[in-house]
């Protein structure tokens, strides 16, 4: 996961945008990546950041916990 | 409507610091980002570093090798830019400037003079 | 960091004709086919205003003489016809990416 978080990071080269694109990374069980993208006011890099980054994040933690479930863990 | 309103003019010896503050007005101050800019008499741009308020995050220009703080006052929706270790080529117009969309500087403040002299 | 390499350095025009700017960055400021490129008009005493964002919109109450053009690296600002109120200094702008630079300025006067 934060491989390939580093990975789509790495081509915003403004902080802030950056930035936005690891928080979408967090964990959040309540709220859709677009629900919390909806609260983001300073531009649509960072909504653009923040969604690529939280549905990438959101995939691979959900492919991590099928495989983990398959494997009887 | 929209305002970025800069402190006054200010002397200073060389080795000390200064303080510019920018307070904002006619927005949502923790929306946008807050960059400062200096041009030095007869000179061009030179962009110094921002502080996207919200949350705090901070960028600086390396040129200044940590002399450069950048803060913001959400309470008063003012931003301020502090130079330390000041030289006689610090003598510059500062001025503050919000970036919109994270693209382009659309309103700046009127400049605050600083000079530095012995 | 991004260059920004302004020409001329400074021009002299007639009222009624062109002016025409030009503004080379080192490295592409194109990032998914969006020009992170910015125009500036800086009149003596006053703070820069902005003419021109993403290479070519023309920000609301700036008159239609100016225009702007470009992508990837090369980069125009066109004044067409020029009036004697356009005697400024022009500058270029990118915000791809921190740090954020700007040219070196045009000094555009008015014969």
């Known amino acids: 996961l934060q491989e390939k978080i580093e990975e789509i990071a790495a081509k915003y080269k403004h902080l802030v945008v950056k930035k936005c694109c690891y928080d979408g990374v967090r964990i959040n069980h309540d709220e859709t990546c677009e629900q919390r993208a909806a609260r983001i006011s300073v531009g649509p890099r960072c909504v653009k950041a923040f969604t690529e980054c939280c549905v990438v994040a959101s995939q691979l933690r959900a492919n991590n916990s099928h495989k983990d479930l398959q494997l009887g863990r | 409507q929209v305002q970025l309103v800069q402190s006054g003019a200010e002397v200073k010896k060389p080795g000390s610091s200064v303080k510019v503050s920018c307070k904002a007005s006619?927005?949502?101050?923790?929306?946008?980002?807050i960059h400062w800019m200096r041009q030095a008499p007869g000179q061009g741009l030179e962009w110094m570093g921002y502080?996207?308020?919200?949350?705090?995050?901070?960028n600086y220009n390396e040129n200044f090798k940590g002399r450069v703080t950048i803060t913001a006052d959400k309470s008063t929706s003012t931003a301020y830019m502090e130079l330390s270790s000041l030289r006689s080529e610090d003598t510059a117009v500062y001025y503050c400037a919000r970036e919109r969309n994270l693209e382009y500087f659309d309103y700046w403040g009127q400049g605050t003079t600083v000079t530095v002299s012995s | 960091d991004i260059v920004l390499t302004q020409s001329p350095a400074s021009l002299a025009v007639s009222p009624g004709q062109r002016a025409t700017i030009t503004c080379k960055a080192s490295?592409?400021?194109?990032?998914?086919?969006?020009?992170?490129m910015n125009w500036y008009q800086q009149k003596p005493g006053q703070p820069p205003k902005l003419l021109i964002y993403?290479?070519?919109n023309l920000d609301s109450g700036v008159p239609a003489r100016f225009s702007g053009s470009g992508s990837g690296t090369d980069f125009t600002l066109t004044i067409n016809p020029v009036e004697a109120e356009d005697t400024a200094n022009y500058y270029c702008?990118?915000?791809?990416?921190?740090?954020?630079?700007f040219g070196g300025g045009t000094k555009v006067e008015i014969k």
């Open positions: 490295q592409s400021v194109d990032f998914e086919g969006f020009n992170y």
């Open positions: 993403a290479a070519s």
């Open positions: 702008q990118q915000s791809l990416e921190d740090p954020h630079t």
């Open positions: 502080i996207y308020p919200r949350e705090g995050w901070t």
């Open positions: 006619g927005y949502t101050f923790t929306d946008h980002i």
